[in-house]
Interface confidence: low
């Protein structure tokens, strides 16, 4: 049976979803266990004017010592104001000084990056040491690069489309995810549904997705269900500021007692099927419906509070 619920974009003041992911449009992770220099390459595309970017490098201690020296090659297509955090890391940074402006003195060794096309930049970087990771990111707001984490099966890093960078790189896109909403026809009452659909990633290892839900209404005003659907290898850690009905695939737990896993359900894996699920749970409004790439952290901020859906 077709569910009549015309999904339309919801204005950011009604609902906004941000997320952190390891999925990249192009990337690679390789192992270079004996290299003196750990080389990482980031190609960053900023589609609208100058952007601000938070870039954090985190080192994992290996055998009680800090990792080898790191070369980070930063290739950007337009002006970026960079907030760099790389405490205690022996970092060399190669970048285009006419495009990258630091928010504070970087406190690291810097090198001017030649104005080469991508393939030549990779060659230039590889001349300095074997490339551990490379990634192409579109409009990042923040990037976390974990050093000494590379667990790729490749010995040589070659950019490939649609890659999962695993623990090596996580990033947050600047543009929030598209949030849509609709009224479920023929259902009375004020119960609202928030539906999050996480799409399969490019590596199928077990994953926990942390879902932070912040609904700005008084607890007594709210009758809501949170529907989380994802691939079978995804479990959920829920951090919500309201009590609500939970309906998920896989297993889920709550941040307040994460050790207690609760088994979920088998849910449809189509938008239409999930809308049907919301209707079956007596929701009259789908206050937010979001489809995301495989993410590690998802934050939903919504201010619908039953019966007042506004689409943009």
């Amino acid at each position: 049976e077709t569910v009549h619920c015309d999904l339309q974009p919801v204005g950011p003041e009604r609902g906004e979803v941000t997320y952190t992911t390891s999925q990249v449009s192009k990337g690679c992770v390789a192992q270079a266990p004996n290299a003196i220099l750990e080389v990482h390459v980031l190609f960053l595309e900023f589609p609208t004017g100058p952007s601000q970017l938070e870039l954090t490098l985190q080192a994992s201690k290996q055998n009680g010592t800090w990792p080898r020296e790191v070369l980070l090659v930063l290739s950007v297509n337009s002006s970026v104001f960079l907030h760099l955090q790389a405490l205690g890391i022996p970092l060399h940074l190669a970048y285009n000084s006419s495009l990258v402006t630091f928010q504070e003195p970087p406190g690291v060794n810097t090198t001017e990056l030649p104005s080469f096309p991508k393939t030549q930049i990779l060659e230039w970087a590889a001349e300095r040491g074997p490339i551990t990771s490379a990634a192409e990111l579109n409009d990042p707001q923040s990037i976390l690069l974990r050093l000494g984490q590379a667990q790729g099966s490749l010995s040589f890093c070659m950019l490939e489309a649609s890659q999962d960078m695993g623990r090596t790189l996580e990033w947050r896109p600047r543009t929030p995810a598209l949030v849509r909403g609709c009224h479920l026809e023929g259902v009375a009452g004020h119960k609202e549904a928030h539906i999050l659909r996480v799409l399969p990633g490019h590596s199928a290892g077990p994953r926990t997705v942390t879902v932070k839900v912040e609904l700005s209404c008084a607890p007594g005003d709210l009758d809501a269900v949170l529907i989380l659907q994802g691939p079978p290898y995804v479990s959920w850690l829920i951090d919500a500021n309201h009590n609500m009905q939970i309906w998920t695939t896989g297993e889920y737990s709550f941040k307040i007692f994460p050790e207690k896993n609760i088994r979920g359900f088998k849910l449809p894996d189509t938008p239409q099927g999930l809308l049907g699920e919301a209707r079956m749970l007596n929701a009259s409004i789908v206050a937010s419906f979001v489809e995301l790439p495989l993410a590690s952290i998802v934050s939903l901020h919504a201010s619908s509070c039953g019966g007042r859906l506004q689409t943009s």
Partner: antibody
Framework: EVQLVESGGGLVQPGGSLKLSCAAS????????MDWVRQASGKGLEWVAE??????????YYAESVKGRFTISRDDSKNTVYLQMNSLKTEDTAVYYC?????????WGQGTLVTVSS | EIVLTQSPATLSLSPGERATLSCRAS?????MHWYQQKPGQAPRPWIY???NLASGVPARFSGSGSGTDYTLTISSLEPEDFAVYYC?????????FGGGTKVEIK
């Protein structure tokens, strides 16, 4: 809903000072880059100053025409951005708009009129 | 600084007509943003990053261009479209606005 409300405009003599305020609501103010843009009567828009977010060390930037005379500041605890205007000139007469930069100026206040005249 | 020149300064057209507003940059820019302003009101974001319509902007508006030449087009003018339109760049410091194009009723 994003709201920006300017205040503090008025009549001041050349060489005098004035402090404009902009009260913000409806978004996470501490993450926002905030700007002042002005418009003289019947003229176009002119960017004046910007203050960035805490993550960007509250860095400030100014148009050449106001550098050394105007100071932009913010109080994240009060969700307010300020423009302290000193050594005012007659050519500073304009409506001053508070605005938020998020890839473009996506939200604007209604403006406050500053008149510099003897 | 990059100077943005908008032409024409005034465009006199009737409802239903097509309007083409031009913004030329003194040197190449990555993107252009456009704002609409009506008398006694604050500017409103209209088109961002050359071709993306801001929230609530009707589909009869479109933006295009690259390098130094950018265009805002209104396919069929409605009464509420008569206003001043400003272009703006920030591919290079400082941020600059164009002088505006006034679209008035003929």
């Amino acid at each position: 809903e994003v709201q920006l409300v300017e205040s503090g405009g008025g009549l001041v003599q050349p060489g005098g000072s004035l402090k404009l305020s902009c009260a913000a609501s409806g978004f996470t103010f501490s993450d926002a880059w905030m700007d002042w843009v002005r418009q003289a009567s019947g003229k176009g828009l002119e960017w004046v100053a910007e203050i960035r977010s805490k993550a960007s060390n509250h860095a400030t930037y100014y148009a050449e025409s106001v550098k050394g005379r105007f100071t932009i500041s913010r109080d994240d605890s009060k969700n307010t951005v300020y423009l302290q205007m000193n050594s005012l000139k007659t050519e500073d007469t304009a409506v001053y708009y508070c605005t938020r930069w998020r890839r473009f100026f996506d939200s604007w206040g209604q403006g406050t009129l500053v008149t510099v005249s003897s | 600084e990059i100077v943005l020149t908008q032409s024409p300064a005034t465009l006199s057209l009737s409802p239903g007509e097509r309007a083409t507003l031009s913004c030329r940059a003194s040197s190449s820019v990555s993107y252009m943003h456009w704002y609409q302003q009506k008398p006694g009101q604050a500017p409103r974001p209209w088109i961002y990053a050359t071709s993306n319509l801001a929230s609530g902007v009707p589909a009869r508006f479109s933006g295009s261009g690259s390098g130094t030449d950018y265009t805002l087009t209104i396919s069929s003018l409605e009464p509420e479209d008569f206003a001043v339109y400003y272009c703006q760049q920030w591919s290079s410091n400082p941020l600059t606005f164009g002088g505006g194009t006034k679209v008035e009723i003929k």
